[in-house]
Each structure stands twice: as structure tokens, then as C-alpha cells.
Interface confidence: low
Amino acid sequence: QGNRWRRSKRASYVSNPICKGCLSCSKDNGCSRCQQKLFFFLRREGMRQYGECLHSCPSGYYGHRAPDMNRCARCRIENCDSCFSKDFCTKCKVGFYLHRGRCFDECPDGFAPLEETMECVEGCEVGHWSEWGTCSRNNRTCGFKWGLETRTRQIVKKPVKDTILCPTIAESRRCKMTMRHCPGGKRTPKAKEKRNKKKKRKLIERAQEQHSVFLATDRANQ
């Protein structure tokens, strides 16, 4: 590094590549003024600093336009790799998500991480939970010891990408029925249900038998 400086001091510093685009250049410090539209950037070599005039600023710096001269200024945003301005990041360090010009290790509420771009995008926005519904089972509010009560919430805004899942919009929990027995002395309709199911099954079996017989005779006639 030191040799480079010794060489450039012997040579005419104007021909030094560091002086490209300069309005003012010195052998010790390189550029100190840049041509219009170029950005002044202070580069380090060891503990020496020297100026360069660049068309665009290096990673970790942004182009700051000023009346006296445009310059490259350091991104001061935490965990930011490159930025557009003093307070707007465009690329975060590895492991951080970009959201509105800032870098986060976790996306804020209402936003979901998009792993392929490491950005926080608008997640699925849901409303508030409703009150818990009536405790019921098989659409009945009596006749059982335990039932289920449900609450729901609406999707207010769909996510920008289909790959982003919405949180659950309905949830149920076990609840104790207020009436173990239904009014009017009716027993639990379990036995009746069982009888009906048995009847139904027998009817289906009989119909299937008849259908098989019909197919067999039909084939014989052909």
C-alpha cells in the first residue's frame, strides 16, 4: 500500500487514476473537488485517506447531493448493507429483513417475511375476534354434558403473495353445557339416532342386493 503512494508521488499525480474526474487533485490526498454529477468518496489506504470522484457510491455508502459538491456518505442505518439516502436502506445485512427503509430481525406486526427477497411484505390482515358463540353440539344446546363454542374473525386484507398464509380465522374450545337434559323430559336422542342409522343401513344393503340381481339377469338376457 505504501509503495503505491511512493510511486504516485514520483509520477505526475494528474495522470494518477485517482485524479480521474477531479477538478482539484493533490499528490497527498487525491481529489478534493469533483466534476459535476460525480460523487466525492474518501477511500482509505492504511491510515492515509484520499479522495476519488465516482459515478456511483460504493456499497455501504449513498450519494448525497449538495450545492458545493456531491459526496458519498456512509449508511448509518443499523444492519444496513447499502442505502439510498441517510435514512433509507435498500439492502440489509444477511439475516435481516428490509421494511420501509429499515432492517429488522423480525418483521413488524401485520407484515410477513418474504425469504426470497428478505423483505417484509404486507401479511394477511385480520380483524378482531368475535365473542365466543353458544355452547352447542350437533346444533343442539342441550342434551349433552360437553359441547363446543366457536369464535371467528374476518380477513380484512388478503396478503400480497399467495405463499403467505393467513392466521386462523375460526377457533373452537370445549365448553360445559348449561342444560345437561333438554326441557320436556326428552332423553338424549342417542338411542333413536342409533335405530335410525340401523334402518338406513339395512335399506341400503337391500337396495344394493336388488341392483346386483338386476345386473345379473340383464347380462343373461344379452
Epitope: 482539484s24 497527498d28 490526498n29 478534493s32 482509505r44 492515509r48 479522495g51 445485512k93
Partner: antibody, heavy 119, light 110 residues
Framework: EVQLVESGGGLVKPEGSLKLSCVAS????????MSWVRQAPGQGLEWVAH??????????YYSGSVKGRFSISRDDSRNMVYLQMNNLRTEDTATYYC??????????WGQGTQVTVSS | QPVLTQSPSVSASLGASVKLTCTLS???????IEWYQQHPDKSPKFLMQ??????SKGDGTPDRFSGSSSGAHRYLSISNLQLEDEAIYYC?????????FGSGTQLTLL
Amino acid sequence: EVQLVESGGGLVKPEGSLKLSCVASGFTFSDYFMSWVRQAPGQGLEWVAHIYTKTYNYATYYSGSVKGRFSISRDDSRNMVYLQMNNLRTEDTATYYCTTDEDWYFDFWGQGTQVTVSS
Amino acid sequence: QPVLTQSPSVSASLGASVKLTCTLSSQHSTNYIEWYQQHPDKSPKFLMQVRDGSHSKGDGTPDRFSGSSSGAHRYLSISNLQLEDEAIYYCGLSDVSLYLFGSGTQLTLL
């Protein structure tokens, strides 16, 4: 908001040792060069030591008056920079400031910690 | 000859303008320099970096402050002086392996 908080100052006898600490917040500490600058009572500013980042292998530089006695180090995982001061002299009595270094100048300063070397 | 030379004190009136000077030794005459401001019992504050004919200000440095240079001289100009401008102003420069400060100029408002 960039914040630098120094600690570890105090009264020490000549030829004694002291370790100053500086905790940084509000910026990506591992990206920044760090320095210690001191100011003797009623005097001007004096640069003391400087440490580069990991990219530059944590290279260190010292002013002639402290070389061989002081040692600067950093712990990026804890956002800390340290100044180990050995074989202290009365002329080391000063307020020691921890500073961030933008492009080899000191753009942010801590509140300082007082070091008094006296028998 | 010191690397950076500053006059010990300067006085000026409230609302007026003032120009502080930092003179570089011949071997450093092309260097950039920095200006720092320090109020009594406070930490120094970076104001700006001055190059040949241009400057880069630090965050929070008022527009009333500007920097310029002429040969080996570097200037800090303050217009419309305010009470809070009363402070010591240091210039500083980086060399190959060290950083040097000037002795400071005390700005007093009349």
C-alpha cells in the same frame, strides 16, 4: 440514535493500571473504526489510539506518548471498545473520550470518563 | 513548526460573523482538516471536514457554519453568531498513522 458510554475511569497511582470500557449503540458497531481521544484538565484534545474493523484485521494505531503502554481492543459481539492502560504516568491524567470514526475523523463522542494518576 | 496552528482566542459580537483560521505546516498543506466544537464541560462535537474549496458537514451542523480553504489555510466561518456558538473550536487532521489536533481557538461573544 448513536450513543457511546464510557466507564472504568478513576484514581490510580503512578505505574498502576486501569481498563476503560465503552459501550456503543444506535449503529452497526462492527462496521466502524473506533478511537480514544483524551483531554488533560484545561488543555486541548489529544488522539490516543485507534482500532480498525475485522475487515482490516483489527489493526491498531497509537500516539507516540502511549505506544507500548496502552492497548486498544474491541468486542463486536458486545458492541464494546476497550483501552487497557498500563504503567500510568501523572501526565496521563485526563478525560478519556470514546469516539466513532467516519472517514478517519471523529463524528460521534461519548460523555467521557475521568482518569486521575496521582500518588 | 507545529503541524496545525490556531490563534488562542477570537472575540465577536452577537449576530455578527467570524472567520476562524487553522494554518497547516508546509508538508501538510494539501491535507483535509476537520473542525470540532467544544462547549465548557461538554464532549467535543464534529462540525465539518474541509477540503480544497469544499466541505462536508456533520449531522446537526447549522447552515450558519461553513468551511473554506486557501493555500495552507483552512477556515471556519460562522455567520449570524448566536450565544450557543461561544465555545472552543479545534481543527484536526489525519496523517499516515496518527491524528493531530490544533491547540484550539476560544470564541467569545461580546
